[in-house]
């Protein structure tokens, strides 16, 4: 499975979209987990709503939000207020009982904001409303680069 590299600016939001075959993964919850080491386990960060028919509702754990468009086959994860410690290897997973199928591997890289060393002035980053927005996860304000490369053996 190829690894997608996503870069986000510290302090901003990074949006990750993992696409999947909607029919194949029908009825399955999705999860976002963080890989602990190259061969280590993947530690669950957040998963979609426990009721699959409500998977489009945003579920949050700390600064990470997940929502699943089950009809379109896209699960969206938003990492808010990105910090250096958020950098690392993650997975989008499809859950089936106790089994987890990897949909996508994502390497998150955090770039230091050059404004951190200067006076940020009146820079304003919009906060997401907590109101119901269904599958409409807000667009990331970060500058994303998306490249794929084959996994190293």
């Amino acid at each position: 499975l190829n690894t997608t590299v996503l870069q986000g600016m510290a302090g901003q939001s990074l949006r990750v979209s993992c696409t999947y075959d909607a029919l194949k993964h029908w009825g399955r919850r999705k999860a976002w987990c963080r890989q602990l080491g190259e061969e280590g386990p993947c530690q669950r960060v957040v998963s979609t709503h426990g009721v699959w028919l409500l998977a489009f509702l945003k579920k949050r754990n700390g600064s990470t939000v997940i929502a699943d468009d089950t009809l379109a086959g896209t699960v969206t994860i938003t990492l808010k207020n990105l910090q250096a410690g958020d950098a690392g290897l993650y997975q989008c997973q499809s859950l089936r009982g106790r089994e987890a199928e990897v949909l996508q591997k994502v390497l998150v890289e955090v770039l230091e904001d050059p404004l951190d060393d200067q006076d940020a002035g009146d820079l304003w980053v919009p906060e997401e409303s907590s109101s119901f927005e269904g599958a409409q996860v807000e667009h990331s304000t970060s500058r994303n680069q998306e490249t794929s490369f084959p996994p190293t053996s």
Partner: antibody, heavy 126, light 106 residues
Framework: EVQLVESGGGLVQPGRSLRLSCTAS????????MSWFRQAPGKGLEWVGF??????????EYTASVKGRFTISRDGSKSIAYLQMNSLKTEDTAVYYC?????????????????WGQGTMVTVSS | DIQMTQSPSSLSASVGDRVTITCQAS??????LNWYQQKPGKAPKLLIY???NLETGVPSRFSGSGSGTDFTFTISSLQPEDIATYYC????????FGGGTKVEIK
């Protein structure tokens, strides 16, 4: 006029089966998720289960106490939602309501229920 | 499972009074909460969804607020037709209702 009408309630012995119907009119039935709720005499409301809109192909979810005993289905051609209740217990005695989930513009639904039927009484007793 | 605790279980107020009902969730449910009104012998009626959004056609004297674990439902000026039992309902985990609050006129 948007309307839901339940039918099929009555007195039934424990262990037996009963099928409730919820006939919809005044709206495009297939575009909405439908849910069943119940209310035991003098008690509060309890969610029983729901079925997704046509786009979800009849996908259902149930509360733990009825899972494996109750089945929700829908007939789009007749605009009817059904609640098939098997292995009934005395604790299933209640008024059963069907309700429509709110619809959002972008095609998803909302688990707030904006149209309700008048209810049908189910009594499980020997 | 999430527990929804509604209080008070009943209250008596005069016409024109401000009435407040609270609903407390056993864990954070963000704003995934609805409020319903049920008059005796009738089906429930949706009043508020997403904790604070007024359903179409519902009088503006009804309002809701809160997020996380603590929610409030308010009738700004109680009317005789508001005699009913009011229920909160979460949808963060399943669809769990509070125990209800019966509102009567003094």
């Amino acid at each position: 006029e948007v309307q839901l009408v339940e039918s099929g309630g009555g007195l039934v012995q424990p262990g037996r089966s009963l099928r409730l119907s919820c006939t919809a009119s005044g709206f495009t039935f297939g575009d909405y998720a439908m849910s069943w709720f119940r209310q035991a005499p003098g008690k509060g409301l309890e969610w029983v289960g729901f079925i997704g809109s046509k786009a979800y192909g009849g996908t259902t979810e149930y509360t733990a106490s009825v899972k494996g005993r109750f089945t929700i289905s829908r007939d789009g051609s007749k605009s009817i939602a059904y609640l098939q209740m098997n292995s009934l217990k005395t604790e299933d005695t209640a008024v059963y309501y069907c309700a429509r989930g709110k619809r959002r513009d972008y095609g998803y639904w909302h688990p707030a229920f904006d149209v309700w039927g008048q209810g049908t009484m189910v009594t499980v007793s020997s | 499972d999430i527990q929804m605790t509604q209080s008070p279980s009943s209250l008596s107020a005069s016409v024109g009074d401000r009435v407040t009902i609270t609903c407390q969730a056993s864990q954070d449910i963000t704003n995934y909460l609805n409020w319903y009104q049920q008059k005796p012998g009738k089906a429930p009626k949706l009043l508020i969804y997403d904790a604070s959004n007024l359903e179409t056609g519902v009088p503006s004297r009804f309002s809701g607020s809160g997020s996380g674990t603590d929610f409030t439902f308010t009738i700004s000026s109680l009317q005789p037709e508001d005699i009913a039992t009011y229920y909160c309902q979460e949808y963060d985990q399943y669809l769990t209702f509070g125990g209800g609050t019966k509102v009567e006129i003094k």
